[in-house]
């Protein structure tokens, strides 16, 4: 859901030739198309196994998709003078698996970053920080789209993949001023703990097509601009009262819970009650039981308590299978 | 040659609903953000919203926010802005407006002639 | 939200003066400020994008410069078609905005 960057027939892409001379400030890269008139460089599926060191000056839109850069180190676009203007850097199907502390140091415009559809293997805590200081300087990034970066299971780090992305994100309290975090498509089991409460500007978080099983440890209490949250395609099975009262507290925010394996057991009845009555959740009609068997399909909406029931648990001695 | 043009203003009574429209030509739709700006009779400009080209993100000035729904139809080239629970300040002339680059990047390069939405009892 | 602040609210020159009119963001934005010219019943037309950058068909007269606050649109020498109202918008910002306008009369 990123931002679209747009070529214009007015204005063609130049496709750059390699040349000896020593590069000047407003040349095309080599294997790159460049158009001056919209701010725009894409160096797209070229194989490129490392950043471009001439990027013109006047770059606000930079495309790096489809390549081979395996590392972004330290300082990968610092340049002297610095790319002052780059506000929107796309790094997505770079087969990029590590991305290390200060990568993105020396942007002082950066305002949205996508580093979707990459296996990233390491991604340093200090990726978005730049330093180790418990408080950093403020990234001016607003939004931040990791869909789709977690590594095959044999490139995984030890620690969970969960815990490291989380690491970057609140590293230095340098967020504060996302607006869109998406986290979709990474196979996470369960959000952190303390990952909100270091992002309290978000308007929008994505975190469908995940795992996730639980939101009981979450908490959305400070997220008062939330506009879109998005838990569709996860493994949610009920929303506890703690949940819903603070997603009902969010001023602005709509909620979308679709395809979800809910469990239509006695657990379930605050959250029916609660959805039966918030404006909240966006296409509640079409939630549906999962488990048990003879709740699947049924609509949680038309349910009532006496449906919600659960089967009493039967001492050892009595249980058959 | 790119044209942009607005439709669907009228008279509205404060509380009410009206979708506005903006039929785009001239150029490919789908790979431009694009926005809405409004002008109260005698005002200064207001930007109202903005959505990227494939329609994944949307922005809303505080003002209109959880009232306004921008939205597009790539296959129809047009461009949405649903406006509920109207106000009298939402009186305006609704201009809607191509942006040339990406949306933190860009300016507004073509714009339409604008579009009366009058919100009154 | 970032604010922007144009000055003066309104002037008047006469053909063949330079004119400039400035406009102040309430936080640094780089270059991304753009500039507009509304004439009566008209919808607003781009003249200057990228702080100083002249868009296309727009008369080399106009100029823009300026980064981080503060910023300035310049018309070497004024032209009886460049009485309009003149609006500076800031793009850095999650959420853009429009300066309030500058109003320029011909004398």
């Known amino acids: 859901t990123s931002s679209a960057s747009s070529s214009s027939s007015s204005a063609p892409f130049l496709a750059s030739a390699a040349s000896a001379q020593p590069p000047l400030p407003d040349q095309c890269p080599a294997l790159c198309e460049c158009s001056e008139a919209a701010r725009t460089v894409k160096c797209v599926n070229r194989n490129l196994t490392e950043v471009p060191t001439d990027l013109p000056l006047y770059v606000r839109n930079l495309f790096l998709t489809g390549n081979q850069l395996a590392v972004l180190p330290a300082g990968a676009f610092a340049r002297r003078p610095p790319l002052a203007e780059l506000a929107a850097l796309n790094l997505s199907g770079s087969r990029l698996d590590e991305v290390r502390g200060g990568a993105f140091e020396h942007l002082p415009s950066l305002r949205q970053l996508d580093l979707s559809h990459n296996p990233l293997a390491y991604l340093s805590p200090f990726a978005f920080s730049g330093s180790n200081a418990s408080i950093s300087a403020p990234s001016p990034l607003v939004e931040l789209i990791l869909n789709h970066i977690v590594p095959p299971d044999d490139k995984r780090q030890n620690r969970s993949f969960e815990g490291m992305v989380a690491a970057a994100l609140v590293a230095g309290r340098a967020l504060q001023g996302l607006h869109l975090l998406e986290l979709a498509s990474n196979h996470f089991l369960y959000l952190p703990r303390d990952v909100l409460a270091q992002l309290p500007s978000l308007r929008y978080l994505d975190l469908s097509n995940n795992s996730l099983v639980s939101l009981t440890y979450v908490s959305f209490r400070n997220l008062t601009h939330l506009e879109s949250l998005h838990l569709e395609d996860n493994a949610l099975k009920v929303l506890h009262n703690g949940t819903l009262a603070e997603l009902q507290g969010l001023p602005h925010v709509r909620v979308f819970l679709d395809n979800n394996p809910w469990v239509c057991d006695c657990h379930m009845a605050d959250m029916v009650t609660w959805l039966k009555q918030t404006g909240v959740v966006q296409g509640k009609d079409r939630l549906t039981c999962a488990f048990p068997e003879k709740m699947r399909n049924r609509v949680l909406l038309e349910l009532n308590s006496a449906d919600l029931d659960c089967d009493p648990i039967l001492p050892p001695s009595l249980q058959t299978s | 040659e790119v044209q942009l043009l607005e439709s669907g203003g009228g008279l509205v009574q404060p509380g009410g609903s009206l979708r506005l429209s903006c039929a785009a030509s001239g150029f490919t739709f789908s790979s431009y953000a694009m926005s809405w700006v409004r002008q109260a009779p005698g005002k200064c400009l207001e930007w109202v919203s903005a959505?990227?080209?494939?329609?994944?993100?949307?922005y809303y000035a505080d003002s209109v926010k959880g009232r306004f729904t921008i939205s597009r139809d790539n296959s129809k080239n047009t461009l949405y802005l649903q406006m509920n629970s109207l106000r009298a300040e939402d009186t305006a002339v609704y201009y809607c407006?191509?942006?040339?680059?990406?949306?933190?990047?860009?300016?507004?390069?073509?714009w339409g002639q604008g579009t009366l939405v009058t919100v009154s009892s | 939200d970032i604010q922007m602040t144009q000055s003066p609210s309104s002037l008047s020159a006469s053909v063949g003066d330079r004119v400039t009119i400035t406009c102040r963001a309430s936080?640094?934005?780089?270059?991304?400020l753009n500039w507009y010219q509304q004439k009566p019943g008209k919808a607003p037309k781009l003249l200057i994008y990228?702080?100083?950058s002249l868009q296309s068909g727009v008369p080399s007269r106009f100029s823009g410069s300026g980064s981080g606050t503060d910023f300035t649109l310049t018309i070497s020498s004024l032209q009886p078609e460049d009485s309009a109202t003149y609006y500076c918008?800031?793009?850095?910002?999650?959420?853009?905005?429009f300066g309030c306008g500058t109003k320029l009369e011909i004398k």
């Open positions: 936080q640094s934005i780089s270059s991304f």
């Open positions: 990228a702080a100083s």
């Open positions: 959505i990227s080209g494939s329609g994944g993100s949307t």
């Open positions: 407006a191509r942006y040339y680059g990406g949306y933190y990047s860009a300016w507004m390069d073509y």
């Open positions: 918008q800031q793009t850095y910002g999650y959420l853009h905005t």
